[in-house]
């Protein structure tokens, strides 16, 4: 092809190359064709008779303004057709006549601001029309019942101020899962307009000025219809009362979508009507009290998204949202609720009570005042078979013995990102039998006992990033109980010391992260007594992370046990020499990483075993002695291996000999070197 | 099913010192600490101490760590328990135990070793 | 060191009684406490771990309860085999004291 569009598996992409017609030498085989954001005026039909196969074409982001009708007859086969960000205005009965097949149509962002006569009456298997960011002033697409199988209407973007039911009757045969009205300045529901509409089950109307009056009105126009999803984002709908959902009693609403709506009161029996209900989401509000019986008749929400409802209106504490107690328990089938991002002054002892089915809690960020965890924080949820909480970012300083008592189903247990500063005697964690990860990273301080999580041998996963860890070189260990434990994170706690014993009987241990600590001196042949062999037993490690830890020595035999990593991070260290044999029991290591350390030699005998199987290696910034002994088969391995090494041309540097300094190691020069060959 | 059984009884005289064992079977030795109970006649029990059969490391009563020393063997399972300098009032029943998947309890005991002090 | 007191050291009841008995710690040991039976020339049995968590085999007529200092075992209703000594033990630092004991004695 003389274009220099790439073509693979029958598509065709020609986008982004300045195309001022449409390319003549494709295949002839093509079934989708992409010419968007190109320079293309008109599509000639005749242009097209060679691609007679295609079922879709693109052609959005070029200035067509005239469609000839002829095209779909040359395209027989058509099914997508794409014409998004054109300069259409007018669309003729005969513009569209022979696109029988369409099943999706794109006009968003033409210039299409009236439709006369009937276009698109031949499309009778189309799903989806697409005529948003138009100029419509009206929803009037035709005078006749047609497009019996739709789906999909999108009207946003336009200029539609009413509804009226003899403009949508052409759907009179339709069933439409989404009706899309949004960013219109509706101001008039005319009676029976959704009646019209054979079946309306989605109707979307965000960023619409609806407000309080409105909405009551557009729910009265829709009893009685099969609407499932009304969506009515940002619809300045600040109150509700008992009555302005009324109309939604005669349907089966499942889906309600009240977000961002600056919604302030929240009246009781507000959603009484909607006992079908199972998704509802009023995040981004402004809720100033939840009463008792705000959310009455919610008897089959499953999932209620309350994110940045509850949020103060000024520095006053008086002006705290307020949440009465029981004002959930209408929530019987509640599985997901997320209360993040909020400003609630604390847990009453009823806040949760009925939540009968709630599986899902998350409360990051949502309290002002919830310093301490007690034995009674969390007593409305005993009777919730609570699975996962987040509990992150609530500046809680202290877990008190039994708080999370009442949880006994509790799996996943997220206390990141907060202030908590003690000492761990375990009791913290009674009643978590089933509990799978504890997520504690990023606090102020843990000092931990033998007992830490002597009630929790069922963790799997224990989450202790930078939290100033103390006392992790007791013994017994503070993980002995944690035989179950598959992934451990111990990083960024400074640690300087540990026994030999921290991590033994762990052997299910799969991840083990310990980077940016101190753990040098551990690994010294000096060190009093020899170096500590704090990796041994955990024949099921994969994933070992030391980086940033100072190491400068590895005694020989301390990776020996893990004979089933498969990724190791050595990087960021002061390594220089390794010994030989070091990585011999590293058979299924996958990759290494020793990126910044002063490694000056890769000899056989030390990466030989380590680099057999590798996918990836970063040894990058490292002063490689350009000689030789030192890399000679280093580079011969390079140069036929597999392995993928990131930026292998501009990071892998010769620091010496002087002469050799700087040039990259891959291009050194092996012929002169005997015996240096990679494989053998 | 996890057994301890212990050496059989024994008659020392004072200032004299005496060892009893604990062969561990049933579950992998390494694996939990064994730790050392005593209960002389008509006496409460009384914790000793405790060893890690993997790499030797001990934790003991202050009352008792001039005169004990707790060892063990793992080639053949074993841990054991010496006390010198024997006094009468040493005359006890010595046990050890071994804590379960829950680490606060001692769900397993040895049968017990009575070693009698007398000139 | 923490000391562990029990009571009363003896207790004598019949078949069929509840029966209680009280540990006291001198500090604070959260609820690392285990219950043992012994009878004479046996070592003891584990009844009740975790102040009130009940050990495999145990029979449900035996209960614990109580946290911090202050704990108790309870027989809902004494059976023969029930007559023995039952030691109090905490599990919260070395050294892990035991009590002294309660002689539970037919009437």
């Known amino acids: 092809s003389t274009t220099k569009c790439t073509v693979s598996h029958e598509v065709a992409d020609c986008s982004h190359l300045k195309l001022t017609q449409v390319p003549d030498d494709l295949p002839t085989n093509i079934t989708v064709l992409n010419l968007t954001h190109n320079q293309l005026r008109r599509l000639p039909a005749a242009n097209f008779t060679r691609y007679s196969q295609l079922t879709s074409l693109d052609v959005g982001f070029n200035t067509i303004s005239k469609l000839e009708p002829e095209l779909c007859q040359k395209l027989p086969m058509l099914k997508v057709l794409n014409l998004q960000h054109n300069e259409l205005s007018q669309l003729s009965d005969k513009t569209f006549a022979f696109c029988t097949n369409l099943t999706e149509l794109h006009l968003m962002s033409n210039s299409i601001q009236k439709i006369k006569n009937n276009p698109f009456v031949k499309q009778k298997n189309l799903i989806t029309l697409d005529l948003s960011h138009n100029g419509l002033s009206s929803t009037k697409l035709g005078t006749q019942v047609q497009l019996e199988n739709l789906q999909e209407l999108l009207l946003s973007n336009n200029k539609i101020q009413a509804l009226k039911s003899e403009e949508l009757d052409i759907f009179a045969n339709s069933s439409l899962k989404k009706l899309e009205l949004s960013s219109n300045q509706i101001k008039e529901f005319s009676p029976g307009c959704f009646h019209a509409i054979g079946r309306l089950f989605g109707l979307f109307l965000n960023n619409v000025q609806l407000g309080p009056s409105l909405t009551e009105k557009l729910c009265l126009e829709l009893a009685n219809t099969s609407i499932r999803n009304l969506s009515l984002s940002n619809s300045q709908l600040s109150t509700t009362s008992n009555t302005t959902f009324l109309g939604l009693k005669w349907t089966n609403l499942t889906m309600l979508d009240l977000s961002y709506n600056n919604l302030n009161v929240v009246g009781n029996d507000s959603f009484a009507w909607l006992p079908q209900l199972e998704y509802f989401f009023l995040e981004y509000n402004n809720i100033q009290h939840l009463f008792s019986h705000s959310l009455h008749g919610l008897f089959n929400v499953r999932y209620l998204n309350l994110k940045r409802s509850f949020t103060k209106q000024s520095i006053s504490l008086a002006s705290l949202p307020k949440i009465d107690d029981f004002s959930f328990q209408w929530l019987k089938c509640l599985e997901h609720l997320n209360m993040e991002d909020n400003d609630i002054p604390g847990i009453k002892s009823n806040m949760f009570t009925g939540l009968i089915n709630l599986k899902y809690l998350s409360l990051s960020n949502s309290f002002t005042s919830l310093r301490t965890l007690t034995n009674e924080t969390f007593v409305s949820l005993a009777h919730s078979p609570l699975h996962i909480l987040n509990l992150t970012k609530n500046k809680i300083s202290k877990i008190e013995s039994d708080a999370f008592s009442w949880l006994g189903h509790l799996e996943v247990l997220d206390l990141g990102l907060n202030e908590i500063g003690q000492e761990l005697t375990g009791q913290e964690w009674r009643g978590l039998e089933n509990i799978f990860e504890i997520y504690l990273s990023y606090n102020k301080y843990l000092q931990l006992t033998r007992n830490s999580f002597a009630l929790v041998p069922s963790l799997q996963r224990l989450m202790l990033r930078r939290v100033a860890l103390k006392n992790v070189d007791s013994s017994p260990s503070p993980f002995q109980p944690l035989r179950n434990l598959t992934i451990l994170d111990l990083s960024n706690n400074n640690i300087a010391n540990i026994n030999d014993d921290m991590l033994e009987g762990l052997e299910k241990l799969e991840i083990l992260d310990l980077q940016h600590n101190n753990l040098a001196r551990l690994w010294k042949h000096a060190n009093p007594g020899g170096p500590i062999y704090f990796l041994k037993g955990l024949s099921h490690l994969h994933i070992l992370n030391l980086e940033s830890n100072g190491f400068d020595e590895i005694p020989v035999e301390v990776f020996k046990d893990l004979f089933e990593l498969k990724i190791i991070d050595l990087g960021l260290n002061n390594l220089n020499t390794l010994p030989a044999s070091v990585f011999n029991n590293q058979v299924s290591l996958k990759s290494l990483n020793l990126q910044k350390n002063l490694i000056t030699s890769v000899e056989k005998k030390v990466f030989g075993p380590a680099f057999r199987n590798l996918t990836e290696l970063d040894m990058r910034f490292n002063p490689f002695d350009c000689t030789c002994e030192s890399i000679a088969w280093f580079v011969n391995w390079i140069n036929e291996t597999h392995t993928n090494i990131p930026e292998l041309s501009s990071h892998y540097l010769c620091n010496t000999p002087p002469h050799y300094h700087g040039f990259p190691v891959r291009l050194f020069d092996t012929s002169s070197c005997k015996d240096s060959a990679p494989f053998e | 099913q996890v057994q301890l059984v212990q050496s059989g009884a024994e008659v020392k005289k004072p200032g004299a010192s005496v060892k009893v064992s604990c062969k561990a079977s049933?579950?992998?030795?390494?694996?939990?600490?064994i730790h050392w109970v005593r209960q002389a006649p008509g006496q409460r029990l009384e914790w000793m101490g405790e060893?890690?059969?993997?790499?030797?490391?001990?934790n003991y009563n202050e009352k008792f760590k001039t005169r004990v020393t707790i060892t063990r063997d793992t080639s053949a399972s074993t841990a054991y328990m010496e006390l010198s300098s024997l006094r009468s009032e040493d005359t006890a029943v010595y046990y050890c135990?071994?804590?379960?998947?829950?680490?606060?309890?001692?769900?397993?005991w040895g049968q017990g070793t009575l070693v009698t002090v007398s000139s | 060191d923490i000391q562990m007191t029990q009571s009363p050291s003896s207790l004598s009841a019949s078949v069929g009684d509840r029966v209680t008995i009280t540990c006291r710690a001198s500090?604070?040991?959260?609820?690392?406490l285990a219950w043992y039976q012994q009878k004479p020339g046996k070592a003891p049995k584990l009844l009740i771990y975790?102040?009130?968590t009940l050990a495999d085999g145990v029979p449900s007529r035996f209960s614990g309860s109580g946290s911090g200092t202050d704990f108790t075992l309870t027989i809902s209703s004494l059976q023969p085999e029930d007559f023995a000594t039952y030691y109090c033990?905490?599990?919260?630092?070395?050294?892990?004291?035991f009590g002294q004991g309660t002689k539970l004695e037919i009437k």
């Open positions: 135990a071994r804590v379960g998947v829950m680490i606060t309890t001692f769900p397993y």
């Open positions: 049933g579950y992998t030795f390494t694996t939990y600490w």
């Open positions: 060893i890690n059969p993997n790499n030797g490391r001990i």
């Open positions: 500090g604070n040991i959260h609820n690392y």
């Open positions: 975790n102040a009130k």
């Open positions: 033990q905490h599990f919260w630092s070395t050294p892990f004291t």
